[in-house]
């Protein structure tokens, strides 16, 4: 058992059937010796006596808010979460995980150590939340993050809804045009009732980077269908941009087609590379759609932003 | 040429072959889902590389100022990877494809290191470590960590020479 | 996830021709290269070729020379195999699979497998 | 071309024992060579490359070994879900070659 905050406890429990449960001793913070008694919120009366309760944990029933009490008054309180482990593998009951089989999701438009982190959740029910840097060596990046919040966006996976919560981290020392050669470390603890998990990711910023779409998307008739199409950086990208250089893919999008953001790249089917920040194409209905990459290093690439063909004279 | 005397590199060339070399480097390794070697213990293979770090001037305002730190650094990297490339880490078997973007990656960074660093002027180069895996999946782990690392390298060094074409060229 | 995704079962006559397509998914198809194998029914497994999506060269087995050509549409992400002058011991299940364009690899990821019958 | 001779060509055995499937090249090739697993109407599946690499996902039971012209597939432990046709594939040299196969049936 370990302290995870002020009297609350984790107990690491081997969930195997046959498993002889955690023995955990309860010890009533109080100068007070004799008369004690101990309750449970999740069993009826009294559970024991005496300054030190002793109990074994392997079920949920055993978790919960213990009270130690004195004649009608309450001493002091232990709240007990279950750590679970089966066949030698904790549980991750309480995320859903995304589509590539990780649980946390981090992404940073651009290289000044501002990112933001999410996660799904199964059932979204008593959850408290605490993302940090995991890593204790004096040279790891430290990084501050802010409090959890549910998005209002819902993420369907498997026919299924879940819900999004998201947390804004910032590493406390940032050097954006330097090479990262240490990752950074983040562990994520969630609470559901009397359930304990902790999740971790790793990853160096330039593997999350995501810009966001460009601006300021616009269309200049030329000859025949041929039209200009312009558009500028997004603000969120890092300066200045003659060294944090984009490269965009522009496409024609068809009538009723759904653009698609794919988890493959940005090259997708039927678009084209441009380096510069405007491209003649020929377009004569639908859209004309650009996504943004990092020029140089092949993170993913920002949603679509699309102008329609029409050109407004 | 970046030659004696601190005077300054074909930025335009540079960029060009810079560029170059982090779409080979991305061929040369894709980071999909292909990877499917158990992953391996973080040993110390490639800690000795050489990184552009904060204090090499890689910067917009340290390039402004005098960009020979960070070419120096670039240099030394590229000579770095390009004899890691030449090792036996790559041309043990499984043996390297002749047309592979791997071995034009090879060739484009002694390209670029020729660029920095005319005949006769030496600039100090780091020692590459003697690695020689026995096993040929030992050798592709080596391979892969060489290349990962090959590309967030070359990605600085493409930044740099692109601001440098931009804002420091005569 | 990385998909090979091929064409449907194909009936020919002795003589004719077959084309096999290949549609991949969820990596960037010009990093890599297509391996085409067979198998004839109860038999074990045969290269034909390959081809570098990187650069669209091209190496063919001896068996096949003359009558196979493998190619690649980069905008589709598509690699196809054509095979002519079709003969019964053609008869097999055709598969794509994934190809180092760097070094010889093992074949890590292969198609679902296309069956072309030749018979009169 | 480099041929590659597997042995036995069926083999058929019971749950919980241990199997040794042998593949010999007709020159020397290194470690490249790999091992693959196919079930009846399914595509062939990597199961150990360069040898004796394992790779993710694959069972610990199934183990490789050798180098230059002699190669041993093992599966420690048979379970009924092995029952497959087993091919070694060498990618030393162009043509890749394949074993004819090993079939293990269970008993």
């Known amino acids: 058992m370990w302290e995870l905050e002020k009297d609350v406890y984790v107990v690491e429990v081997d969930w195997t059937p046959d498993a002889p449960g955690e023995t955990v001793n309860l010890t009533c913070d109080t100068p007070e010796e004799d008369d004690i008694t101990w309750t449970s919120d999740q069993r009826h009366g009294v559970i024991g006596s005496g300054k030190t309760l002793t109990i074994t944990v392997k079920e949920f029933l055993d978790a919960g808010q213990y009270t130690c009490h004195k004649g009608g008054e309450t001493l002091s309180h232990s709240h007990l979460l279950l750590h679970k482990k089966e066949n030698g593998i904790w549980s991750t009951e309480i995320l859903k995980n995304f589509k590539n089989k990780t649980f946390l999701k981090c992404e940073a438009p651009n290289y000044s150590g501002r990112f933001t982190c999410s996660w799904l959740v199964q059932r979204n029910m008593d959850l408290k939340f605490n993302i940090k840097s995991s890593s204790s060596s004096p040279d790891s990046r430290a990084v501050t993050c802010g409090m959890a919040s549910l998005s209002a966006e819902k993420v369907t996976l498997d026919q299924r809804d879940y819900e999004k919560y998201s947390v804004s981290c910032q590493e406390d020392v940032t050097c954006p045009t330097a090479e990262e050669t240490l990752p950074i470390e983040l562990a994520l603890e969630a609470r559901q009732q009397n359930k304990y998990e902790n999740y971790s990711t790793s990853f160096f910023i330039r593997d999350i980077i995501k810009p966001d779409p460009p601006k300021n998307l616009q269309m200049k008739p030329l000859k025949n269908s041929q039209v200009e199409v312009s558009w500028e950086y997004p603000d969120s990208w890092s300066t200045p941009h003659s060294y944090f250089s984009l490269k965009f893919f522009v496409r024609i999008q068809r009538k009723k087609e759904k653009m698609k953001e794919t988890e493959e790249g940005c090259n997708q089917k039927g678009a084209f590379l441009v380096e510069k920040t405007s491209t003649e194409v020929q377009c004569k209905g639908g859209n004309v759609c650009v996504q943004a990459q990092d020029r140089y290093y092949n993170s993913s690439c920002s949603k679509w932003a699309c102008v329609p063909c029409r050109v407004r004279s | 040429r970046a030659v004696p005397g601190g005077s300054s590199p074909a930025w335009t060339q540079c960029q060009q072959l810079s560029q170059k070399l982090c779409t080979l480097a991305w061929s040369a390794h894709p980071l999909v889902g292909h990877m499917d070697l158990r992953e391996e213990g973080d040993e110390e293979t490639t800690n000795d590389v050489p990184h552009i770090q904060c204090g090499d001037g890689c910067d917009p305002q340290g390039l402004r100022d005098n960009s020979q730190f960070c070419l120096q650094r670039i240099h030394q990297g590229l000579i770095f990877y390009e004899k890691l490339l030449g090792s036996d880490i790559f041309t043990g078997e499984p043996s390297l494809l002749p047309d592979s973007p791997v071995g034009q990656l090879h060739a484009s960074l002694l390209g670029l290191s020729q660029l920095l660093q005319p005949e006769g002027h030496h600039w100090e180069t780091q020692q590459i470590p003697s690695l020689s895996p026995s096993q040929p999946w030992q050798r592709l782990l080596l391979r892969f960590k060489i290349l990962r690392s090959l590309q967030a390298f070359v990605a600085v060094a493409a930044r740099v020479f692109a601001h440098g074409a931009a804002t420091l060229s005569p | 996830q990385v998909q090979l995704v091929q064409s449907g079962a194909e009936v020919k006559k002795p003589g004719a021709s077959v084309k096999v397509s290949c549609k991949t998914s969820g990596y960037t198809f010009t990093y890599y290269g297509i391996s085409w194998v067979r198998q004839a029914p109860g038999q074990g497994l045969e290269w034909m070729g390959l081809?570098?999506?990187?650069?669209?060269?091209?190496n063919y087995g001896q068996k096949v020379q003359g009558r196979v050509t493998m190619t690649t549409d980069t905008s589709t992400s598509t690699a196809y195999m054509e095979l002519r002058s079709l003969r019964s011991d053609d008869t097999a299940v055709y598969y794509c699979v994934t190809e180092n364009i760097n070094w010889r690899d093992a074949f890590d990821i292969w198609g679902q497998g296309t069956m072309v019958t030749v018979s009169s | 071309e480099i041929v590659l001779t597997q042995s036995p060509d069926f083999q058929s055995v019971t749950p919980k024992e241990k199997v040794t499937i042998t593949c010999r090249a007709s020159q020397t090739i290194g470690s490249s060579l790999h091992w693959y697993q196919q079930k009846p109407d399914q595509s062939p599946k990597l199961l150990i490359k360069y040898a004796s690499q394992s790779i993710s996902g694959v069972p610990s039971r199934f183990s490789g070994s050798g180098s230059g012209t002699d190669f041993t597939l093992t599966i420690n432990s048979l379970e009924a879900e092995d029952a497959a046709a087993y091919y070694c594939h060498q990618s030393s040299s162009l043509p890749y070659t394949f074993g004819q196969g090993t079939k293990l049936e269970i008993k």
């Open positions: 081809i570098s999506a990187y650069n669209g060269n091209t």
